[in-house]
């Protein structure tokens, strides 16, 4: 007997599709070997129709695929647009040839069945309503009209024109006529359930002259739509329930043993397991809404249902839509830390992955907020200026082509703790969630700037030094000038880094920046940081105020702008000092500058699709011809 297992018999009808799952034993070889689907001929030969190596036969072109799920030890063959020619014997199997391990599957595709000509068929989804049309002859106009449901022995009344209503249809069934037309009556049944399915007879009049019509009501449960998503990616459940429930509360729930547990609804309920990575977005007045979940985990796989009801909870007889979500562990999205830890006054450098094929896409960073339905206002982007409250302490560094951009946030406070999303205006699957945790600092920061109260005098020379510990000795140190379009790294050379040194004097490691002569444009935030290649690490920030020399005083009162400017973190980083460099300006920041709320983060159409120079986060507007020296003591 074969260790491969699958369905023995599959039957379907023309035009429909099938999804055949084959199970294989849990071994590393099996997970990686070729999977195939072949058709058995009279000679016993089995002709490959599709395989996991990418082969697809002509007769399956455009209508079939084969997906391997190594974490489940299964592979699935999906075949669409079936015809009767697809009827036959097949094998699903493993191995380099079609004589490997396999399982026999019989597929039968039949014609769509014909219905008796005198029966009118109504096909409706659960929770919807149906209006049954019942024609009659004019002579039966004064007679009683009725609708009954056929049972084994009799026909049980649903409703009649004398206002008799079956208890199970009270509030759901209405019998009415339209206008002056005396040849047809209608019965409307709302909030359909599976129990409403069956044969009905509508009747006008009594005895042999009565008008009768047979009705077959089919009530369908929605088929779960299959969603295949990668681990750490995102999924959007697009729910379209119709105008009749537009004003009801909406929900998304996940099927449990006996119930459907609500994950999120528009009344403010949210499952703690999805904290920081879920949004529910009402789309329009037609009952459409979407739920976006980012940072998919293995345990998110399952059977989901969306619906609408005033309670925000699943209710029988109300419209629903369902999905089966599969989370593939063979993910293209790199495994990054989902929790980043910082300390008050310190900094964090967050590496955001994006689809490397979309290096020119616009990159964004938003903060997830759980109030209401949840939303994610953009804080910074390649063409979106930094939000005012993050002035001087937030920047996005794009490294085109390597699949990562970095967001640096410094001068951390405990209020910065929370969930943040990395996203682009390209491939929506690459949305990732980061939880930032901020603890109270218990030691001095790794990087310290002197003087801390930095006021430079116009026209004079001004030097600031950034002290770093020995652990950063081999890394690149840099200074950059912050603007709301990024932090422009000021070119430099680090003499100290080139000197061979056996010991490291903890007290003497510093990188300095000199402004000479100081101009008004030099005023602003400057960052000192470390990085290793393209991996950014700690930063510290200092605000340099520029003032004119006051009479009788060579210095001005220091600004307190640096009260928040100290920093500490545990990553590796850069070494630089400064020389003059004129920098190109960033183009128009695009729609996000005005519409910062990505409440419709799940809706690609809402996202900024403007193209532009997303390849630079630089934004320095320095125009003075200052000299920048690096001093190593």
């Amino acid at each position: 007997k074969s260790p491969i297992f699958g369905p023995q018999e599959v039957s379907s009808i023309e035009g429909d599709s099938v999804s055949i799952t084959c199970y294989y034993p849990d071994t590393s070889v099996n997970r990686h070997t070729r999977k195939y689907w072949c058709r058995q001929g009279a000679s016993g030969m089995c002709t490959t129709l599709i395989s996991s190596n990418g082969y697809l036969s002509k007769e399956y072109s455009g209508r079939a695929n084969l997906i391997n799920f190594p974490e489940n030890n299964t592979f699935v063959i999906n075949i669409e647009q079936l015809t009767q020619d697809d009827t036959g014997s097949y094998k699903c199997g493993l191995g380099t040839s079609n004589r490997g391990l396999s399982f026999d599957v019989s597929l039968e595709v039949s014609q769509v069945p014909e219905l008796p000509s005198d029966t009118h068929v109504y096909t409706k989804d659960i929770g919807r309503n149906v209006t049954i049309e019942c024609p009659f002859k004019r002579e039966n106009a004064p007679s009683k009209k009725s609708l009954c449901k056929k049972t084994n022995q009799s026909c049980e009344l649903v409703i009649d024109s004398t206002e008799k209503v079956n208890p199970s249809y009270i509030g759901r069934a209405k019998l009415f006529m339209k206008g002056t037309d005396l040849t047809v009556f209608y019965v409307n049944i709302s909030h359909l359930t599976h129990n409403d399915a069956g044969l009905y007879i509508c009747q006008a009049g009594e005895g042999p002259s009565a008008d009768k019509k047979n009705v077959d009501l089919q009530v369908l449960a929605p088929e779960p739509e299959l969603l295949y998503k990668d681990l750490r990616s995102s999924v959007t459940f697009e729910c379209d329930l119709g105008r009749e429930v537009a004003n009801e509360a909406k929900y998304l729930c996940r099927m449990n043993k006996e119930t459907c547990d609500v994950i999120i609804n528009t009344l403010g309920k949210r499952d703690p397991d999805f904290e920081g990575r879920i949004l529910i977005t009402p789309k329009d007045d037609n009952g459409r809404f979407s739920v976006l979940i980012t940072g998919l985990r293995k345990e998110d796989a399952g059977h989901y249902q969306c619906g609408a009801h005033s309670s925000g909870l699943p209710q029988e007889g109300w419209p629903i839509q369902t999905w089966q979500l599969f989370v593939n562990e063979e993910s293209t999205i790199p495994n990054r830390r989902s929790v980043v830890k910082g300390v008050t006054g310190g900094s964090v450098a967050i590496a955001c992955p994006y689809n490397p094929k979309e290096s020119s896409s616009l990159k964004y960073w938003c903060r997830w907020e759980g109030d209401g339905n949840g939303h994610c206002p953009v804080l910074v982007g390649t063409q979106a200026q930094v939000q005012e409250e993050y002035e001087g302490r937030l920047a996005l560094f794009d490294q085109p082509g390597n699949g990562t951009y970095t967001v640096i946030l410094n001068q951390l406070t405990t209020e910065d703790a929370g969930f943040y999303w990395c996203l682009t205006n390209g491939d929506s699957r690459w949305r990732t969630t980061i939880e930032l945790q901020v603890a109270e600092a218990t030691r001095e920061p790794n990087l310290e700037v002197t003087p801390q109260n930095a006021t430079a005098v116009l026209g004079e020379t001004f030097t600031v030094s950034c002290h770093y510990p020995c652990k950063f000795y081999s890394q690149e140190k840099y200074w950059c000038k912050w603007s709301n379009k990024g932090c422009h790294i000021l070119p430099s050379h680090d003499e100290g880094a080139r000197q061979s040194s056996v010991s490291c004097d903890q007290s003497s490691q510093l990188v300095s920046m000199t402004l000479n002569p100081v101009s008004k444009e030099d005023e602003g935030w400057y960052w000192c940081g470390v990085k290793q290649g393209q991996t950014y690490g700690e930063t510290t920030a200092i605000y340099i105020a520029v003032e004119e020399r006051t009479r009788g005083s060579s210095h001005v009162n220091p600004t307190d702008a640096n009260a928040r400017a100290k920093v500490a973190l545990e990553e590796e980083v850069v070494d630089s000092s400064i020389s003059e460099k004129e920098n190109k300006a960033i183009p128009n920041p695009g729609p996000f500058a005005n519409e910062r709320e990505i409440q419709n983060v799940g809706d690609q159409a809402q996202e900024n699709r403007a193209s532009g120079d997303a390849g630079s986060a630089d934004g320095q507007s320095r125009s003075s011809s200052s000299k920048h020296h690096h001093h190593h003591h």
């Epitope: 369905p7 018999e9 379907s12 429909d16 999804s19 199970y23 659960i126 099927m255 059977h303």
Partner: nanobody, 129 residues
């Protein structure tokens, strides 16, 4: 909540036939798969057969030990799934359980008990030699 009730069990001679029924009631609209399992005295519960339906398509599964002898079918109108058992053998003696679940395809492995949320109380089948 879905309720499942099995019937049709009994005593039969080797080589005989029986038809087991599994009648579903309650939230039956949310059922997409039904499986039959059996448990012989002193043994673990094992998979016998299953049926999954998805739209107009139906998928039937059977354990190697019953292939060609047992057939699973359903009557949609009556919310009933049948297990037609032919050429019965003494080793088929067991309590037969019906199980159902709202998960269609691909879903969990039909052979695994954990793939079904709703279970019946079971019906005893005894095959005498």
């Amino acid at each position: 909540q879905v309720q499942l009730v099995e019937s049709g069990g009994g005593l039969v001679q080797t080589g005989g036939s029986l038809r087991l029924s599994c009648a579903a009631s309650g939230r039956t609209f949310s059922v997409y798969r039904v499986g039959w399992f059996r448990q012989a005295p002193g043994k673990e519960r094992e998979f016998v057969a299953a049926v999954i339906w998805s739209g107009a398509s139906t998928y039937k599964y059977a354990a190697d030990s019953v292939k060609g002898r047992f057939t699973i079918s359903r009557d949609n109108a009556e919310n009933t799934v049948y297990l037609q058992m032919n050429s019965l053998k003494p080793e088929d003696t067991a309590v037969y359980y019906c199980a159902a679940d709202p998960l269609g395809l691909p879903g969990p492995d039909v052979r695994v008990e954990g793939g079904y949320r709703h279970w019946g109380q079971g019906t005893l089948v005894t095959v005498s030699s």
